[in-house]
C-alpha cells in the first residue's frame, strides 16, 4: 500500500511539475521591467523566451516574436534548450510512469518490469527537474548581471544635456513558476525512485531447510506448518501462503502484509 501511495504521489507531483515547466516555458514574463527607483513610465516591458511584450497605459499590449535564431544571445538559446529538454524528458517520463503504476494492470507485467519502469521514469523526472531549475537559474543569473550593468550606467547622455533612461529588467513570474515546477518534478522523481525500491524483487533471508526422512523427502518451511511432498512435484516458484514463509526463488512485493490488491 505504501509503495502504491508513494508511486502515485510521485506521479501526481511530477505531473504538476511538468505542467508547470511547460507553463513557465510558454510564459512571456521571464523578465519584467524594474519599476523600483525608475522614472514612472507609461509602458511596461516584459520578455519571455520566445517573444517580448509591451503593455501600454492605454490598455494595448503588443508582443513581438524573436524571429531570428542566429541573432539571439547564446545564453537565451541555452535556456530554451534546457527547458525543451526538460519538457521532453518529463513527457517521456510521464508516459513510462503511467505503465509503471502499480494500480494499473497491463497484461501479465511482472513487478520487476514495473520496478524498472518506475526507476526509469523517476530518473527522467529528476533530470527534467534539474534541466528546468538549471534553465531558470541561468536566465536569472543573466538578469542579475544585466541589472547591475545597466544600474552602473543607467543615465547616459551627451554632456549631461540629454538623458537616456536604460530599461532595467528584474525577475518575472515565469522564473518563480519554473523554480517551483522544477523542484516539484525533482521531488516527484525522487519519490518514484523510492517507490521503485519497494517494487523491486529482493532475495529473501528465509532459506528453506530440508530434512531428509527415510521414506520420502519432506521440505519443512520455517514459520509454517504446511509441507509439500518431494515426489516429482516442483516446489520451486510455488507460492505457499503460510503467514510469511516464502520459497527460495519467490518474487514477492514488499511489504506483502499491506498490499490489498
Amino acid at each position: 500500500m505504501a509503495v502504491t501511495a508513494c508511486q502515485g504521489l510521485g506521479f501526481v507531483v511530477s505531473l504538476i511539475g511538468i505542467a508547470g515547466i511547460i507553463a513557465a516555458t510558454c510564459m512571456d514574463q521571464w523578465s519584467t521591467q524594474d519599476l523600483y527607483n525608475n522614472p514612472v513610465t507609461a509602458v511596461f516591458n516584459y520578455q519571455g523566451l520566445w517573444r517580448s511584450c509591451v503593455r501600454e497605459s492605454s490598455g494595448f499590449t503588443e508582443c513581438r516574436g524573436y524571429f531570428t535564431l542566429l541573432g539571439l544571445p547564446a545564453m537565451l538559446q541555452a535556456v530554451r534548450a534546457l527547458m525543451i529538454v526538460g519538457i521532453v524528458l518529463g513527457a517521456i517520463g510521464l508516459l513510462v510512469s503511467i505503465f509503471a503504476l502499480k494500480c494499473i494492470r497491463i497484461g501479465s507485467m511482472e513487478d520487476s518490469a514495473k520496478a524498472n519502469m518506475t526507476l526509469t521514469s523517476g530518473i527522467m523526472f529528476i533530470v527534467s527537474g534539474l534541466c528546468a531549475i538549471a534553465g531558470v537559474s541561468v536566465f536569472a543569473n543573466m538578469l542579475v548581471t544585466n541589472f547591475w550593468m545597466s544600474t552602473a550606467n543607467m543615465y547616459t547622455g551627451m554632456g549631461g544635456m540629454v538623458q537616456t533612461v536604460q530599461t532595467r529588467y528584474t525577475f518575472g513570474a515565469a522564473l518563480f513558476v519554473g523554480w517551483v515546477a522544477g523542484g516539484l518534478t525533482l521531488i516527484g522523481g525522487v519519490m518514484m525512485c523510492i517507490a521503485c525500491r519497494g517494487l523491486a524483487p529482493e532475495e529473501t533471508n528465509y532459506k528453506a531447510v530440508s530434512y531428509h526422512a527415510s521414506g520420502h523427502s519432506v521440505a519443512y518451511k520455517p514459520g509454517g506448518f504446511k509441507a509439500s511432498t518431494g515426489f516429482g512435484s516442483n516446489t520451486k516458484n510455488k507460492k505457499i501462503y503460510d503467514g510469511g514463509a516464502r520459497t527460495e526463488d519467490e518474487v514477492q512485493s514488499y511489504p506483502s502484509k499491506h498490499d490489498y490488491v
Epitope: 522614472p39 509602458v43 497605459s57 533612461v165 530599461t167
Partner: antibody, heavy 118, light 113 residues
C-alpha cells in the same frame, strides 16, 4: 462612433469644489485607459490625470496632486474628476480623452469650462 | 519631468508650400522594449478640441491626410506638412507619451501668409 461628453463645469469660488463627469459611448469603456487634459484660456494643453482601464494605475500632474481625484465607473461608462481646493490657475477648459495606440489621446470630448473666480 | 521644446512657436506658411515643426525632448522617448518612440503630434483647429495626427513618432492615425508625416527618434522629432492647405491652420502640439507626467510642448501656431 466614439463619443465623449463632459459635464459638470461652471463658475466656482477659490477653495471650492467641483465634480466633472465624462460619459463615454461607442467603445468598450472598460478596455481603455482614460485621461483628463486642460487648456487655460489662450494657453497650451496641460495633462491633468490618467486612470487605467481597471483603475489599478492612477497618475496626476504635480500641479493637481492632493487636490484632484480621478475615478471611473465602468458599469456606467463614466469617467470622473473630483476637484477640491480650487485655485484661480485651475480655470480652464477640461477635456476628457480616451487613450489609443502609443498611449496617444486618440479621442477627445468637446470640453467643459471651469472658471475659478471670486 | 520631461521638458518638450517646440520650434518655431509661430509658423507663417504660403498655401501649397511645405511646413516643418521641430520638437525636442529632454530625455529619449525611445522605448527599448519595442524600439518605438513614444511621441505624439496633435492638431488643434481654432475653437475645436485637439485631434490626434501622429503616434509612435511616425505612425499616422487613420483618417489623417498623407501630407502629414512624422519623423525622428530618441529626442529629436519633426512634423512635416508636404503642402499646406487652408484647413491646416491651428496649433500643433507634440507630447511625451513615455514618462509621467505626460508633458506637452508649448505649441506651434501655423498660419497662412
Amino acid at each position: 462612433e466614439v463619443q465623449l461628453l463632459e459635464s459638470g463645469g461652471g463658475l466656482v469660488q477659490p477653495g471650492g469644489s467641483l465634480r466633472l463627469s465624462c460619459a463615454a459611448s461607442g467603445f468598450g469603456f472598460s478596455d481603455y485607459g482614460m485621461a483628463w487634459v486642460r487648456q487655460a484660456p489662450g494657453k497650451g494643453l496641460e495633462w491633468v490625470s490618467f486612470i487605467s482601464n481597471s483603475a489599478y494605475s492612477i497618475y496626476y500632474a504635480d500641479t493637481v496632486t492632493g487636490r484632484f481625484t480621478i475615478s471611473r465607473d465602468n458599469s456606467k461608462n463614466t469617467l470622473y474628476l473630483q476637484m477640491n481646493s480650487l485655485r484661480a490657475e485651475d480655470t480652464a477648459v477640461y477635456y476628457c480623452a480616451r487613450l489609443g495606440r502609443g498611449n496617444s489621446f486618440a479621442y477627445w470630448g468637446q470640453g467643459t469650462l471651469v472658471t475659478v473666480s471670486s | 519631468d520631461i521638458v518638450m521644446t517646440q520650434s518655431p512657436l509661430s509658423l507663417p506658411v504660403t498655401l501649397g508650400q511645405p511646413a516643418s515643426i521641430s520638437c525636442k525632448s529632454s530625455q529619449s522617448l525611445l522605448n527599448s522594449g519595442n524600439q518605438k518612440n513614444y511621441l505624439t503630434w496633435y492638431q488643434q483647429r481654432p475653437g475645436q478640441s485637439p485631434r490626434l495626427l501622429i503616434y509612435w513618432g511616425s505612425t499616422r492615425e487613420s483618417g489623417v491626410p498623407d501630407r502629414f508625416s512624422g519623423s525622428g527618434s530618441g529626442t529629436d522629432f519633426t512634423l512635416k506638412i508636404s503642402r499646406v492647405e487652408a484647413e491646416d491652420v491651428g496649433v500643433y502640439y507634440c507630447q511625451n507619451e513615455l514618462f509621467y507626467p505626460l508633458t506637452f510642448g508649448q505649441g506651434t501656431k501655423l498660419e497662412i501668409k
